[in-house]
C-alpha cells in the first residue's frame, strides 16, 4: 500500500492527528521536501546576524552578518569581526601587522612583503602595513647614481609572529 504521506508536498506536513491529512506548515516553520511528518522551525537571524532571505513554507531563512562582520561556517553559522586593513584577526582581537608584513583586506592574516631581490629587482615603493612593496627594475637596469631603497628585513612566517 502506498504511504498516504508521500502525497504531501513541500510546505506541508502529514498530520497524524488528522488522519494523515496534508496540513500547511504552521507560521515560522517550513518543509523543503514532500512526505514530511513534521515541519522544521525557521532559523531566526538575530543579534549580529541579519536576514538575507526570509523563511517561507518551503525553505529556511538564510542569514548573513551585519556590517563589520563576515560569515564563517556552513550556512553562515558564525559571524567573525572584520579588522582594518593593516591588521589581522588573532584569538585576542585585531592586531596591527608586524613590520615586514601587510594585509590589504579586512580579513585574513598579514603576509610578508614581496622580497624583490629574489627576482633580481629593486624596491620601487616601500611596503606598509596595508600594502605590499612594489618591485621595480633590476638594480643593473637603473641609471648610474639612481638611488635604490633598502630591501625589507626578512619577514616572519605567517602564524609565528610575536604579539
Amino acid at each position: 500500500l502506498q504511504d498516504p504521506c508521500s502525497n504531501c508536498p513541500a510546505g506541508t506536513f502529514c498530520d497524524n492527528n488528522r488522519n494523515q491529512i496534508c496540513s500547511p506548515c504552521p507560521p515560522n516553520s517550513f518543509s523543503s521536501a514532500g512526505g514530511q511528518r513534521t515541519c522544521d522551525i525557521c532559523r531566526q537571524c538575530k543579534g549580529v546576524f541579519r536576514t538575507r532571505k526570509e523563511c517561507s513554507s518551503t525553505s529556511n531563512a538564510e542569514c548573513d552578518c551585519t556590517p563589520g562582520f563576515h560569515c564563517l561556517g556552513a550556512g553562515c553559522s558564525m559571524c567573525e569581526q572584520d579588522c582594518k586593513q593593516g591588521q589581522e584577526l588573532t584569538k585576542k582581537g585585531c592586531k596591527d601587522c608586524c613590520f615586514g608584513t601587510f594585509n590589504d583586506q579586512k580579513r585574513g592574516i598579514c603576509r610578508p612583503w614581496t622580497n624583490c631581490s629574489l627576482d633580481g629587482k629593486s624596491v620601487l615603493v616601500n611596503g606598509t602595513k596595508e600594502r605590499d612593496v612594489v618591485c621595480g627594475p633590476s638594480p643593473a637596469d637603473l641609471s648610474p647614481g639612481a638611488s635604490s631603497v633598502t630591501p625589507p628585513a626578512p619577514a616572519r612566517e605567517p602564524g609565528h609572529s610575536p604579539q
Partner: nanobody, 124 residues
C-alpha cells in the same frame, strides 16, 4: 568526513557549572590542537580556549581564565570544556574547532573545521 559534534549546553543559573563535550570523527584526533570559540547573541566570535594535540599546552581568554578548564581524552576522541562560576555574559553558542596542526597558542587562528555549536544560557 571530518565531523565535530558538541553537546552539554543548556540553561544554568549564575554561579553554576556546565561541562561541554565535543566528539570528533574522521581524523586522527591526537594529531591536532583543538579550540572552543563562542558567539554571544549580539557579538562576533570570541575565542575561549585552545589545547595542543597532546593536551600538554592550554591557553585561555582573559575573560574565562580561572573559571573554565579545557581538556581532552585522545582515547575517546573527545574535547571538553568545564565551565564553573558561570556569568550572564557567558551566554553564547559554543563551537568546537579543529586547528590545522598539533601545536597551538593564544595568538593565531588556524581553524579548518567547525562544529555546529551548543547553546549555553546563563540566567536566573
Amino acid at each position: 568526513e571530518v565531523q565535530l559534534l558538541e553537546s552539554g549546553g543548556g540553561l544554568v543559573q549564575p554561579g553554576g557549572s556546565l561541562r561541554l563535550s565535543c566528539t570528533a570523527s574522521g581524523f586522527t584526533f591526537s594529531n591536532y590542537a583543538m579550540s572552543w570559540v563562542r558567539q554571544a547573541p549580539e557579538k562576533g566570535l570570541e575565542w575561549v580556549s585552545s589545547i595542543s594535540g597532546s593536551g600538554g599546552s592550554t591557553f585561555y581568554a582573559d575573560s574565562v581564565k580561572g573559571r573554565f578548564t579545557i581538556s581532552r581524552d585522545n582515547s575517546k576522541n573527545t574535547l571538553y570544556l568545564q565551565m564553573n562560576s558561570l556569568r550572564a555574559e557567558d551566554t553564547a553558542v559554543y563551537f568546537c574547532a579543529k586547528e590545522g596542526s598539533s601545536e597551538t597558542d593564544d595568538h593565531y587562528y588556524n581553524v579548518d573545521v567547525w562544529g555546529q555549536g551548543t547553546t549555553v544560557t546563563v540566567s536566573s
